[in-house]
């Protein structure tokens, strides 16, 4: 088992909004849960976009999940990752 490296980034979207993206990379096996939480509970699936789980060329995998949020509300969101029985949560950078 190779645990993922998780990285959260933010980018400008429409005015007043930002897109936050949570990337998991360099993990094996390929089964992974990557999702956003808002106010400590699951963010509805229809407001999240997931990338495919793809090989990264080193025998490991990578994927991502993104959502659009209101600027100034970053503190309400965390990215949750679960892989091979281990899990972690990752805040949006300031």
């Amino acid at each position: 088992t190779v645990p993922p490296m998780v990285n959260v980034t933010r980018s400008n979207a429409s005015e007043g909004n930002i897109t936050v993206t949570c990337r998991a990379s360099s993990f094996y096996p390929r089964n992974i849960i990557l999702t956003w939480r808002q106010d400590g509970v699951s963010l509805s699936h229809d407001t999240q976009q997931w990338g495919d789980v793809l090989p990264d060329g080193n025998g490991t995998y990578q994927t991502w999940v993104a959502t659009r949020i209101c600027r100034g509300e970053e503190q309400r969101f965390t990215c949750y990752m679960e892989h091979s029985g281990n899990h972690s949560t990752h805040p949006v950078p300031s």
């Epitope: 849960i33 106010d39 400590g40 509970v41 699951s42 309400r76 679960e82 029985g85």
Partner: antibody, heavy 119, light 107 residues
Framework: DVQLQGSGPGLVKPSQSLSLTCSVT???????YYWNWIRQFPGNKLEWM?????????NYNPSLKNRISITRDTSKNQFFLKLSSVTTEDTATYYC???DGRGAWFAYWAQGTLVTVSA | DIQMTQSPASLSASVGETVTITCRAS??????LAWYQQKQGKSPQLLVY???TLADGVPSRFSGSGSGTQYSLKINSLQPEDFGNYYC?????????FGAGTKVEIK
């Protein structure tokens, strides 16, 4: 370390409003986290009532309809529960509790405040 | 709303025994589950979150497991201080709801 302490009257008359205070020490309620009220009925059933967040937004249990209000006084680092039009069914032990944005589990609880609704 | 059904409602066990408490959600809660212990006259205390992770200071004889709609809390080698009420709680969505509780008594 953060501490929460609930307080308020132990007896409320039917049709009146129930008002409770949660005083927080060791952490500013505007910095982070979600500041909740939970009650436990006789017979031990637990019910989440709602929260006020670090930013001042609310989320309430729909079962309480329009009877509930959670507010705060940031200068005193306190948050409050107001439950209107109470009946004997609102007799319970009321807890204030905190969770953080990683997940809505309650790691910090105040001691309970028993509130009896009776004429 | 997601309903949480706990079983058994009560159980009697001896010190040193292993006990298992189960919690069933009315929908898939994807491991968004916490367990609490409550002693008589005290506030609930967090034991487990994210279905499997022990809270700080919780002894390793406690363990959480499960997925989907079915979850369990196991206590290996029950100790005298473990007697009390246990509750599950989901945090998949609002409103947050708790199970009705399991009372663990001394046999």
């Amino acid at each position: 370390d953060v501490q929460l302490q609930g307080s308020g009257p132990g007896l409320v008359k039917p049709s009146q409003s129930l008002s409770l205070t949660c005083s927080v020490t060791g952490y500013s309620i505007t910095n982070d986290y979600y500041w909740n009220w939970i009650r436990q009925f006789p017979g031990n059933k637990l019910e989440w009532m709602g929260f006020i967040s670090f930013g001042g937004s609310n989320n309430y249990n729909p079962s309480l309809k329009n009877r509930i209000s959670i507010t705060r006084d940031t200068s005193k680092n306190q948050f409050f529960l107001k439950l209107s039009s109470v009946t004997t069914e609102d007799t319970a032990t009321y807890y204030c509790a905190r969770y953080d944005g990683r997940g809505a589990w309650f790691a910090y609880w105040a001691q309970g405040t028993l509130v009896t609704v009776s004429a | 709303d997601i309903q949480m059904t706990q079983s058994p409602a009560s159980l009697s066990a001896s010190v040193g025994e292993t006990v298992t408490i189960t919690c069933r959600a009315s929908g898939n809660i994807h491991n968004y589950l916490a367990w609490y212990q409550q002693k008589q006259g005290k506030s609930p205390q967090l034991l487990v979150y994210d279905a499997i992770t022990l809270a700080d200071g919780v002894p390793s004889r406690f363990s959480g497991s499960g997925s989907g709609t079915q979850y369990s809390l196991k206590i290996n080698s029950l100790q005298p201080e473990d007697f009390g009420n246990y509750y599950c709680q989901h945090f998949w969505s609002f409103p947050l709801t708790f199970g009705a509780g399991t009372k663990v008594e001394i046999k």
